[in-house]
């Protein structure tokens, strides 16, 4: 049965979804256990410049000591104001000084990066040490690079399309996800549905997606259901500022009781099927419908509260 609900973009004042993901357009993670230098390469594409970027390097102590020295190669296509956090990490940074400006002195060793194409930059980096990770990111707002975390099965890092960087790299795109909404025809009442569909990633290990939901309305005003659909290896950790009905695939738990796993349901994996679920749950409005790549953290801010849906 076709569900009549014409999904249309929702204005950012009605709903916004941001997310952090390990999925990259191109990337690789390799293991170089005996290397003196841990080499990471980032190719960053910004559609418009100048852009601001927050780049955080995190080191995990190994055998009680800091990891080996790190070379981070930063290749950008346009002007970037960089806020770098790399506390206590023996970091060497290679970058194009005419394109990258630091918001504060980096306090690390720097090297001018030659104006090479991508393949040559990788060769240049590999001459300095085996590459642990390389990734191509489109318009990042923030990046977290975890050092000493490489779980790759490769011994040699070669950029491949559509990769999951695992725990090595997480990033947040600057552009929020497209949020759509619609009215479910023929359903009375003011119950609203927020539907989040996480698409399968390129690495199918068990994953927890943290979903932060912030709805700006008085607690008593809200009759809502949160529908979370993802691949079978995804479980959900929900951090919500309102009580609402939860309808998920896999398993879910709440931030306040993280050890209490609640079994979800096998849900349809199509937009039409998920709209059908919302209807079956007596929602009259789909206040937000979002499809995302496999993410680690998703934040939903909405201000519909069972009121009138406004599409942009």
């Amino acid at each position: 049965e076709t569900v009549h609900c014409d999904l249309q973009p929702v204005g950012p004042e009605r709903g916004e979804v941001t997310y952090t993901t390990s999925q990259v357009s191109k990337g690789c993670v390799a293991q170089a256990p005996n290397a003196i230098l841990e080499v990471h390469v980032l190719f960053l594409e910004f559609p418009t410049g100048p852009s601001q970027l927050e780049l955080t390097l995190q080191a995990s102590k190994q055998n009680g000591t800091w990891p080996r020295e790190v070379l981070l190669v930063l290749s950008v296509n346009s002007s970037v104001f960089l806020h770098l956090q790399a506390l206590g990490i023996p970091l060497h940074l290679a970058y194009n000084s005419s394109l990258v400006t630091f918001q504060e002195p980096p306090g690390v060793n720097t090297t001018e990066l030659p104006s090479f194409p991508k393949t040559q930059i990788l060769e240049w980096a590999a001459e300095r040490g085996p590459i642990t990770s390389a990734a191509e990111l489109n318009d990042p707002q923030s990046i977290l690079l975890r050092l000493g975390q490489a779980q790759g099965s490769l011994s040699f890092c070669m950029l491949e399309a559509s990769q999951d960087m695992g725990r090595t790299l997480e990033w947040r795109p600057r552009t929020p996800a497209l949020v759509r909404g619609c009215h479910l025809e023929g359903v009375a009442g003011h119950k609203e549905a927020h539907i989040l569909r996480v698409l399968p990633g390129h690495s199918a290990g068990p994953r927890t997606v943290t979903v932060k939901v912030e709805l700006s309305c008085a607690p008593g005003d809200l009759d809502a259901v949160l529908i979370l659909q993802g691949p079978p290896y995804v479980s959900w950790l929900i951090d919500a500022n309102h009580n609402m009905q939860i309808w998920t695939t896999g398993e879910y738990s709440f931030k306040i009781f993280p050890e209490k796993n609640i079994r979800g349901f096998k849900l349809p994996d199509t937009p039409q099927g998920l709209l059908g679920e919302a209807r079956m749950l007596n929602a009259s409005i789909v206040a937000s419908f979002v499809e995302l790549p496999l993410a680690s953290i998703v934040s939903l801010h909405a201000s519909s509260c069972g009121g009138r849906l406004q599409t942009s």
Partner: antibody
Amino acid sequence: EVQLVESGGGLVKPGGSLRLSCAASGFTFSDAWMDWVRQAPGKGLEWVGEIRSKASNHATYYAESVKGRFTISRDDSKNTLYLQMNSLKTEDTAVYYCTTWRRFFDSWGQGTLVTVSS
Amino acid sequence: DIQLTQSPSSLSASVGDRVTITCRASSSVSYMHWYQQKPGKAPKPWIYATSNLASGVPSRFSGSGSGTDYTLTISSLQPEDFATYYCQQWSSNPLTFGGGTKVEIK
């Protein structure tokens, strides 16, 4: 149509072993999280344990009453679920059902009777 | 573990009667599921997620509740409804079933 058919039940002495099988058809078995539930004669239902899909690393979970004695496994190429039961006790006497969870346990086999008696 | 206590454990009723079975959880659960079982047969899925009827279940059945208290109601008992009904939760591991309520003919 979903079909689950259990086999392998029978009479076994306390301390003995038995392996139950459950042949599945009519759905994508490799994606399914599969469970065993048992029912002692004249008693209620008791969850035994579960095995998840390959995507979830075939993770297994067990009821406290069978932990360390029972092992759930699966062969996705044969669409078959297994329950290996070791160190059997008289209180393990029951009809054993294999079942799959979608909205809840919405598909059940017909069950196979396991009798543990000396 | 979350204990589920069903009451009554058995009841006698006549065709056409309204019947209510309750299931009380020892701590709050998100959803309650219900199964129907007839002698010598496997349980049948009956009501899922508190109030949703499984495929083929007549509309005289309904489910409701939240927190720790849940009910299954038969608005007008029919001959084919005489069976044992079990509630079940999976809001906390391990999954648990109620002890069952046997609905018998008066």
